[in-house]
């Protein structure tokens, strides 16, 4: 796993644990609250986050409408259970053993059951709507410049293949960010939309997971995007199952 | 070279607590993960947790939460674990051992910890 | 947790004969498993890491192979002084956990 050699770090996760203790001598880092050996040259997947983080001392119509199976993640954080490669398990339980169904960015697409309620796949989550209120400014963004300043964003701070980056939308002070992936687009070492979300998300709420770096910085032609407010919609492959209108 | 030193037995009162210590010499005390293995007589290895002495991040089998802790003194380059209210099943050995690469390739000796009034 | 199983739980073998341990990990964990001797009444020795890597000082006879879910440690050729407590232990994540151990005598 590669990790910064000179100090020991994990550059793309400060939630880790490192020690030159890996295969070789090399450096090791292992995520906080599951000790998954986690490869520091990339994002590591929202789940072990996650995990991490509950173990840490705890309109006009130029904007897209959501999707009626558009989901939302209401449920707030919980202990997530991942499987070997970090991914999030399709069925979660809490400690009263009420479980439910979830994504591939383990926000909940099914109504809470028992220990009963089985889980058949885990659901992709191919489309991602990242909705961005800003700070009022002066005048309105160049809308180009914005959307090149996002993209740049995407590719650069979190390896994102530029062409999960679908659209840009831009209404003043409304940003709209659309990834997509489906499963058959994301090669071996592609970063996973829903980690490059996660990522961001955490980063615009002045919680960035990088180690060392400075918190987010946007600019566009030198003028500071500060943004307000965060909403995310998540679309499944597969439309959620829960028994009502929510 | 690299060696952990253990003392070879504890006798404790069930419910007085104990802390067993295990210090490190020959290597870098504070580059390696600590870790403690408990072997009941005639059974198996049990992990019971381990510490990280550069920040004393640790980890505990879920297990051993509430009657293991485990601290480091960086100054000595010791490992201690205390064990609180202890009962006759924690009569065991207890093996410190700290790993190059993941394998635990350093053990000490082990400390015989007998509860008994 | 990852759940180590170790089977038999009694090996007894002849010397010079080869002879193989099997250690089955619940779920995928890549090559984290390392190999433990532990002779009577001494600490375990860590024979193989990372499945299949040798540790300098152990014997040649010894080797490990697998990765997955399915392990296995061979001694090529058992000797007398291979007589001992054989444990398999993951390293892939918290809490690691140790299989329950097999024992070799020789017949």
């Known amino acids: 796993h590669t990790a910064a050699q000179d100090n020991c770090t994990c550059p793309t996760n400060k939630m880790t644990v490192c020690s030159p203790d890996g295969p070789g001598g090399r450096c090791q880092c292992r995520a906080l609250g599951s000790g998954v050996a986690v490869d520091c040259s990339t994002l590591t997947s929202e789940c072990l986050l996650l995990k991490a983080r509950m173990s840490a001392p705890k309109n006009a119509r130029t904007l897209v409408r959501p999707n009626e199976h558009a989901l939302v993640d209401n449920d707030g954080l919980y202990d997530p259970d991942c499987d070997p490669e970090g991914r999030f398990k399709a069925r979660q339980c809490n400690q009263t053993s009420v479980c439910w169904c979830v994504n591939s960015v383990g926000v909940r697409r099914t109504d809470k059951g028992d220990l009963s309620l089985r889980c058949d796949e885990l659901v992709r989550t191919h489309h991602i709507l990242i909705d961005l209120r800003h700070r009022p400014t002066a005048g309105a963004f160049n809308h180009s410049d914005l959307d090149a300043e996002l993209r740049r964003l995407f590719r650069e701070r979190y390896r994102l293949h530029p062409k999960f980056v679908a659209a840009v939308h831009y209404e003043q002070p409304t940003i709209q960010i659309e990834l997509r992936q489906n499963t058959s687009q994301k090669a071996a070492g592609d970063v996973d939309i829903g980690d490059a979300a996660y990522y961001f998300e955490r980063d615009v709420k002045g919680e960035s997971l990088f180690q060392g770096r400075g918190g987010l910085d946007l600019r566009v032609r030198g003028e500071p995007l500060q943004v307000e407010r965060t909403l995310i919609y998540y679309l499944d492959e597969i439309p959620p199952k829960f028994s009502m209108k929510r | 070279q690299v060696q952990l030193q253990q003392p070879g037995a504890e006798l404790v009162r069930p419910g007085a607590s104990v802390n067993l210590s295990c210090k490190a010499s020959?290597?870098?005390?504070?580059?390696?993960?600590i870790n403690w293995v408990k072997q009941r007589p005639g059974q198996g290895l049990e992990w019971i947790g381990n510490?990280?002495?550069?920040?004393?991040?640790?980890n505990y089998n879920q297990k051993f939460k509430d009657t293991a802790t485990l601290t480091v003194d960086k100054s000595s380059s010791t490992a201690y674990m205390q064990l609180s209210s202890p009962t006759s099943e924690d009569s065991a050995v207890y093996f410190c051992?700290?790993?190059?690469?993941?394998?635990?390739?350093?053990w000490g000796q082990g400390t015989l910890v007998t509860v008994s009034a | 947790d990852i759940l180590l199983t170790q089977s038999p739980a009694i090996l007894s073998v002849s010397p010079g004969e080869k002879v193989s341990f099997s250690c089955r990990a619940s779920?995928?964990?890549?090559?984290?498993i390392h190999w433990y001797q532990q002779r009577t009444n001494g600490s375990p020795r860590l024979l193989i890491e990372?499945?299949?890597e040798s540790i300098s000082g152990i014997p040649s006879r010894f080797s490990g192979s697998g990765s997955g879910t399915d392990f296995t440690l061979t001694i090529n050729s058992v000797e007398s002084e291979d007589i001992a407590d054989y444990y398999c232990?993951?390293?892939?994540?918290?809490?690691?956990?140790f299989g329950g151990g097999t024992k070799l005598e020789i017949k």
């Open positions: 051992s700290s790993y190059r690469s993941d394998g635990f390739a350093y």
């Open positions: 020959g290597y870098t005390f504070t580059s390696y993960w």
């Open positions: 779920q995928n964990i890549g090559t984290s």
């Open positions: 232990q993951q390293s892939n994540s918290w809490p690691f956990t």
């Open positions: 990372f499945a299949s």
């Open positions: 510490i990280y002495p550069s920040n004393s991040y640790t």
